[in-house]
């Protein structure tokens, strides 16, 4: 706590500008007006203070605004957000996405802090919904963000705003993730035309059910082995030789290499070996000609 | 190019004065606060004084004040250090330095230094 | 404020994970910037704010810490990289540098 001293003569601010540059943490204390401050923090970000100094004018803030800073203060924070805790932020009231761009501009290139997560937790419940504006914006400072996500708070994310995501925003997503984007993503992408479809929906495909990829499969799409690898292992279970060849057109060679990963290696062991050898890429663990296959979950599901 | 280029250095009798410069280029100088840092031969590295953008404030290490003063002039781009009653302690390599320009009181464009020597 | 760097040098060869500290004599939040100067070269920016990685420095160099302690990292040394490694905190005035470490070829 800094003590309460007079202010020198002289020395009493009228601007926030670099003539405080210097000043000792008491000078700023007893020569700074709060409401000042609050008016002109914008300048701040253009002054080399040390962080003893910063401690001095976020307090001052902190007394102004016992219960949280305003729109207008907060927008002009620069890199003094740096120094809130996400408990002063939990505090804030921020609806307006020029100052989410803002405050986020400041820690761009860092992992997400606790006090961004903060933020954005605080945007996103202030605005009722990830719309397509918030979620451009988040997943262009943050690739990750949407992957943070879990599937309850993705079940928000309407349909229109999946047009802003890009396939890196992907990488980090669970399938239980997925299987709540998929759907958005099939609603979404609806109208186009096969190709182009297909390059939309590819990066969601983790969440698809075996009747999509069955359906896929007669376009020509000729799937890729990642995006092969990250479907779900129950959706290609079913799926025929002749599907599977058909999904992935030329990339089927790749089943070799994959061979004893999932799902490839899980649904070789439900193919019959004649079918599997059909495919001229020595693949062994299917199903010896002659024997029955009994599909016992199906059996249950009738009974 | 975003440069910094000191002159100025050379021998002095303990008790001399030197005037060291500092030539900046390729950005807006008077933005900029702007440092002098001291390295001993074999040392590491001192703090000795900063200036503010328009040169209203000034600082100065405990080791310095009184004897150094730190100037610049934004019309000619231009950091200045004069330097008077000279030890033989104040022998070093003296770097100006620039302000970061994020907030914090980091230094982020070095010159490549000027030797000053003390001795008699 | 007083930085304390360990060791003051080190050998190491091309590839070796390097570590160096910085401990402060007071708390300093993340207050601290690292640079690396060469011989006869100006000292370097490769760090601030403890963990901010400076434009056009390479990834192999990292920070962290926070308070009293901090560290700087190279993943896997080049040999552009045997220099001398300096700790700045800019917390208070006076702005003080530690040491030095002086990374050498084994």
């Known amino acids: 706590e800094v003590e309460k001293t007079a202010c020198p003569s002289g020395k009493k601010a009228r601007e926030i500008d670099e003539s405080l540059i210097f000043y000792k943490k008491w000078e700023l204390e007893a020569c700074v007006d709060a409401a000042l401050l609050a008016t002109q923090m914008d300048r701040v970000n253009a002054i080399p203070f040390t962080y003893e100094q910063l401690d001095v004018l976020k307090h001052k803030l902190d007394e102004l605004y016992p219960q949280g800073y305003p729109e207008s203060v907060i927008q002009h924070l620069g890199y003094l957000f740096l120094k809130m805790s996400p408990e002063d932020i939990r505090k804030w009231n921020v609806t307006s996405l020029e100052t989410l761009k803002a405050l986020l501009e400041v820690n761009k290139g860092h992992e997400m802090s606790p006090q961004v997560a903060t933020l954005i937790d605080r945007f996103v419940k202030g605005r009722g919904q990830l719309d397509k504006d918030t979620l451009d914006t988040l997943t262009a400072f943050y690739p990750g963000y949407l992957c943070s996500l879990s599937p309850e708070e993705l079940s928000s994310v309407p349909p229109s705003s999946i047009w802003a995501v890009r396939p890196q925003d992907l990488d980090t997503c669970d399938p239980r993730q997925l299987d709540v984007l998929y759907p958005k993503a099939r609603l979404a992408f609806q109208n186009m035309n096969g190709s182009e479809y297909f390059v939309k929906i590819q990066s969601f495909l983790g969440g698809a059910p075996t009747e999509d990829l069955k359906a896929l499969s007669q376009q020509n799409v000729s799937m890729d082995l990642a995006t092969f690898m990250k479907l779900r292992t129950d959706a290609v279970l079913p799926l025929t030789v002749a599907e599977v060849q058909k999904l992935l057109g030329p990339h089927v060679e790749g089943l070799k290499a994959e061979e004893r990963h999932r799902p490839v290696r899980d649904w070789i062991l439900r193919q019959r070996q004649d079918d599997l050898d059909t495919l001229g890429l020595g693949l062994q663990g299917g199903i010896p000609n002659g024997y029955l296959v009994l599909d016992l979950s199906m059996q249950e599901a009738l009974s | 190019e975003v440069q910094l280029l000191e002159s100025g250095g050379g021998l002095v009798q303990p008790g001399g004065s030197l005037r060291l410069s500092c030539a900046a280029s390729g950005f807006t100088f008077s933005s900029y606060a702007m440092s002098w840092v001291r390295q001993a031969p074999g040392k590491g590295l001192e703090w000795v004084s900063a200036i503010s953008g328009s040169g209203g404030s000034t600082y100065y290490a405990d080791s310095v004040k009184g004897r150094f003063t730190i100037s610049r002039d934004n019309s000619k781009n231009t950091l200045y250090l004069q330097m008077n009653s000279l030890r033989a302690e104040d022998t070093a390599v003296y770097y100006c330095?620039?302000?970061?320009?994020?907030?914090?009181?980091?230094?982020?464009?070095w010159g490549r230094g000027t030797l000053v020597t003390v001795s008699s | 404020i007083q930085l304390t760097q360990s060791p003051s040098s080190l050998s190491a060869s091309v590839g070796d994970r390097v570590t160096i500290t910085c401990r402060a004599s007071?708390?300093?939040?993340?207050?601290l910037a690292w640079y690396q100067q060469k011989p006869g070269k100006a000292p370097k920016l490769l760090i601030y704010?403890?963990?901010s990685l400076e434009s056009g420095v390479p990834s192999r160099f990292s920070g962290s810490g926070s308070g009293t302690d901090f560290t700087l990292t190279i993943s896997s040394l080049q040999p552009e990289d045997f220099a001398t490694y300096y700790c700045?905190?800019?917390?208070?005035?006076?702005?003080?540098f530690g040491g030095g470490t002086k990374v050498e070829i084994k």
């Open positions: 330095a620039k302000w970061g320009g994020r907030l914090y009181w980091y230094f982020d464009l």
């Open positions: 700045q905190q800019f917390n208070n005035y006076p702005l003080t």
């Open positions: 704010d403890a963990s």
């Open positions: 007071q708390g300093i939040s993340s207050a």
